[in-house]
Structures are given as structure tokens and as C-alpha cells.
Interface confidence: medium
């Protein structure tokens, strides 16, 4: 899957502890689950459950594992090559326009509309007009417009795979 990184993701600088495995970089890059040493000579393993890296990289630090917020459930823990996978709790969903928070799903459709899609962790209920069958143009995004992620990775702004 894809990867974008910000300063908030960077783990604090870590000295290479004895338990951290080292290997040599390949073409100046270190494999997933590792970061490069400051002198560029070694690849140092990330610490399981604390930080990770998902792709070949020249990161000076592994990336800090995400902690799921309240209102989210942890689907899978952080490993050295994959961040924590968080998902909105039942009855809530995450929108592309506000990926930082889970929002409550609506309990029903407006008058004159029928429900054709259930609340999921990544989409609100979907409503269509009874007569025309057209989708509601209000808050509810069409299914194909909602935030999703690759197969095996439930939708979450903090989810990724290596």
C-alpha cells in the first residue's frame, strides 16, 4: 500500500540498543522494518510494538506506532513493518473529509427516501429517493466516494501495509 509521512509520525531518536538487529543497506536504503543509521552504514531494526517502517527507506528513525483513539477499535497491532490498524466503533464511520475522527451514523433516512446501504466503519447509511432511486445529495457520500483501503486493510487514516 501507499505511504506518506509527517513529522508527527517520526519516533524519537533511538540509540541502537543491543537487541536491535543490524544489517547492511542495499543501494543506500533499508528494508521494511528497519531504518538507516546516521552514518548510513547500517540498517537498524524497528522496535516491535513501538515503531515501524513499511517500505524501503533512508529514514533516520522508524515511525511511531499509532494509538487508536477512543471511539476506535484496534483491528491489528503495530508490527515492525505495519502500523496499527484502527477502525471506527460500531455505529460510527470515518469520512474522507474528516479522517481524524469517527462520526455517528445517522439512524434513518429523510422523509421520502429509503435506506439502501448500512452504516459501516467507513460510510454512513446510504439513502435514495423512493421514486427516482437517486442518491441523497446531502451529507451521505456515495459508497465509491468513501475512504477505503486496500484489501485486508480496513479503512482507517492510520492503517497501512508494508
Amino acid at each position: 500500500e501507499s505511504a506518506l509521512i509527517t513529522q508527527q509520525d517520526l519516533a524519537p531518536q533511538q540509540r541502537a540498543a543491543p537487541q536491535q538487529k543490524r544489517s547492511s543497506p542495499s543501494e543506500g536504503l533499508c528494508p521494511p522494518g528497519h531504518h538507516i543509521s546516521e552514518d548510513g552504514r547500517d540498517c537498524i531494526s524497528c522496535k516491535y510494538g513501538q515503531d515501524y517502517s513499511t517500505h524501503w527507506n533512508d529514514l533516520l528513525f522508524c515511525l511511531r506506532c499509532t494509538r487508536c483513539d477512543s471511539g476506535e477499535v484496534e483491528l491489528s497491532p503495530c508490527t515492525t513493518t505495519r502500523n496499527t490498524v484502527c477502525q471506527c466503533e460500531e455505529g460510527t464511520f470515518r469520512e474522507e473529509d474528516s479522517p481524524e475522527m469517527c462520526r455517528k451514523c445517522r439512524t434513518g433516512c429523510p422523509r421520502g427516501m429509503v435506506k439502501v446501504g448500512d452504516c459501516t466503519p467507513w460510510s454512513d447509511i446510504e439513502c435514495v429517493h423512493k421514486e427516482s432511486g437517486t442518491k441523497h445529495s446531502g451529507e451521505v457520500p456515495a459508497v465509491e466516494e468513501t475512504v477505503t483501503s486496500s484489501p485486508g486493510t480496513p479503512a482507517s487514516p492510520c492503517s497501512l501495509s508494508g
Epitope: 505511504a3 506518506l4 509527517t6 475512504v147 483501503s149
Partner: nanobody
Framework: EVQLLESGGGEVQPGGSLRLSCAAS????????MGWFRQAPGKEREFVSA????????YYAESVKGRFTISRDNAKNTLYLQMSSLRAEDTAVYYC??????????????????WGQGTLVTVKP
């Protein structure tokens, strides 16, 4: 709102090189993660490379490791992708992407990012 304009695409022979540029307008990119994705005809959009802000390091897909180099010039508000030893399988539309907020964590291609319109790279004999 951020606008991204890619350039530098074109047709090149296998083994050749190209340098893609992505000029951002609307805000300074210095504190934001940026990256490149690509989409080949009939295939899913895939991650190519990403740049951490402030020279914190870079990410590369295994398929481009050692051949592509990502860099950025924060003063010019521009992201680059130097592509060398190009192969037929590198043929794709290349998209520049920037994180929507400084707090946006690592995201998927369908996450909360701004996207450019793309520039076509064709590698053929």
C-alpha cells in the same frame, strides 16, 4: 486549497531517464509529507515514493528502489522524482500527492490527500 502541477513526463527508451517535477501552489509544502503514485493502464494506482518533511528521509516502493530518487525544494515549493534505468513496466501516469494537514499520518492512496492531474511517462523501444 492546494494545487499541484506535474511536469516532465514523456516518452523514453528503456534504460533512459526522466525527471518529474511537481509545483505546489496555495500553501508552503515544507511541513507536509509529499509523494508520488502511479497508475498504469488497467491497473490500480500504486505507491512509488514519499518524502518526509525537513529531510527526515524517504520511502520507496521495492519496484523502484535504486532507480528512482525523490527530492524536494521547499524554497521553490516543488517535489521531484528522478527516474533512471527506466523499464517498460514503469509506463504509467505519475501523480504528485501532498498530505492534507501536517498531522495527516501515513495514508493510503485514497486517504486525505491533495492530488495533481498527473503526467504520462511512456517507456518503449
Amino acid at each position: 486549497e492546494v494545487q499541484l502541477l506535474e511536469s516532465g513526463g514523456g516518452e523514453v527508451q528503456p534504460g533512459g531517464s526522466l525527471r518529474l517535477s511537481c509545483a505546489a501552489s496555495g500553501r508552503s509544502i515544507s511541513n507536509y509529507a509529499m509523494g508520488w503514485f502511479r497508475q498504469a493502464p488497467g491497473k490500480e494506482r500504486e505507491f512509488v515514493s514519499a518524502s518526509v518533511w525537513n529531510n527526515g528521509g524517504n520511502y520507496y516502493a521495492e519496484s523502484v528502489k535504486g532507480r528512482f530518487t525523490i527530492s524536494r525544494d521547499n524554497a521553490k515549493n516543488t517535489l521531484y522524482l528522478q527516474m533512471s534505468s527506466l523499464r517498460a513496466e514503469d509506463t504509467a501516469v505519475y501523480y504528485c500527492v501532498v498530505a492534507r494537514t501536517p498531522e495527516t499520518p501515513i495514508t493510503s492512496a485514497r486517504g486525505a490527500n491533495y492530488w495533481g492531474q498527473g503526467t504520462l511517462v511512456t517507456v518503449k523501444p
